[in-house]
Amino acid sequence: QGWQAFKNDATEIIPELGEYPEPPPELENNKTMNRAENGGRPPHHPFETKDVSEYSCRELHFTRYVTDGQCRSAKPVTELVCSGQCGPARLLPNAIGRGKWWRPSGPDFRCIPDRYRAQRVQLLCPGGAAPRARKVRLVASCKCKRLTRFHNQSELKDFGPEAARPQKGRKPRPRARGAKANQAELENAY
């Protein structure tokens, strides 16, 4: 309750491919960064596929106010919700409600959050109460993952090549995040 969505558009994406955006310009503070040494999980291919770019899942863009108790954000935030099954991009509908989702005959592929980001929000509260500052966790992008037969969230397997955690330097790839956080809020919000 209290979540007001006033914009809802959808785009089709191909996760895990292409260039990653430049990070925002540095704030004028005393952040200091060093490039971390290489580490983490090497790229892998959980199952055979001729062209990963053939597979896609959908990001729904929602712009809405966020709330914390009786307090509401001064400005709306735009976030993503990962929607639907994954399948060959050529068979996915270009708009929600058109066509049919392709379902693989074998494992189930799910479109889930890939990366998260933090956004600062100021919350305005009723009755003259002091405003609050919070950092909200927002989905930054979606990806296709393979769902095991037990359909356990923690058992989601990567679909397509995935780099290890970005080794953070001047041009990092925003860090991959798991599927657990924020799912309940997103499911309840719409």
Partner: antibody
């Protein structure tokens, strides 16, 4: 529930390096924002660095720039903090700390048990 | 780098009220510093009491509260208990870079 388990105590000589590990359970490391904090004997807490989810980068405290490296192994959900060119004043308990993966980012909610690093010749 | 200041020590009587403060060398502390308060007892890791100025955690006793007072972050303890004797640290967020205060040793007697 997030749980953090750190590696055991270390004794190092001046000039050497130390690498402390922090194993995450309950969530995957990629869902969390990991930070490192140290505490010298009888002294206060000192933030060394950590992952900033606003711009997707690991940020190091100015004091440790060039000496500290924070890395993560997502295959084992283990974070590492390596401090080089050790000196006696680096003798401290080193903590990893992380958020709780909620809708609102709340950092430093869960702490490891600490790793004592002693630097002595 | 900013310096975060706290009272080195404070004493409170059991059942009494005490306020710990946290100032910044860069000016007034605001909600945009997302002040944190931690409690640490000897031989233990710190634990978070307050995040984001005033947000309590499930394990935070109701007698603790966070606020901003006179350009500083404040932690108020109302109805002090013997088990509240500990070191208390504040932490401020300077745009992704964090700085701890020097800590306040709180004695309950």
């Amino acid at each position: 529930e997030v749980q953090l388990v750190q590696s055991g105590a270390e004794v190092k000589k001046p000039g050497a390096s130390v690498k402390v590990s922090c194993k995450v359970s309950g969530y995957t490391l990629t869902e969390l924002s990991m930070h490192w904090v140290r505490q010298a004997p009888g002294k206060g807490l000192e933030w060394m660095g950590g992952f900033d989810p606003e711009d997707g980068e690991t940020i190091y405290a100015q004091k440790f720039q060039g000496r500290v490296t924070m890395t993560e192994d997502t295959s084992t959900d283990t974070a590492y903090m390596e401090l080089s060119s050790l000196r006696s004043e680096d003798t401290a308990v080193y903590y990893c700390a992380t958020d709780s993966a909620g809708y609102w980012y709340k950092f430093f909610q869960h702490w490891g048990q600490g790793t004592l690093v002693t630097v002595s010749s | 780098q900013a310096v975060v200041t706290q009272e080195p020590s404070l004493t409170v009587s059991p059942g009494g009220t005490v306020t710990l403060t946290c100032g910044s060398s860069t000016g007034a502390v605001t909600i945009d510093h997302y002040p944190y308060w931690f409690q640490q007892k000897p031989g233990q890791a710190p634990r978070t009491l307050i995040s984001d100025t005033d947000d309590k955690h499930s394990w935070t006793p109701a007698r603790f509260s966070g606020s901003l007072l006179g350009g500083k972050a404040a932690l108020t303890l109302s109805g002090a208990q013997p088990e509240d004797e500990a070191e208390y640290y504040c932490l401020l967020d300077y745009g992704g870079t964090f700085v701890f205060g020097g800590g306040t040793k709180l004695t309950v007697l």
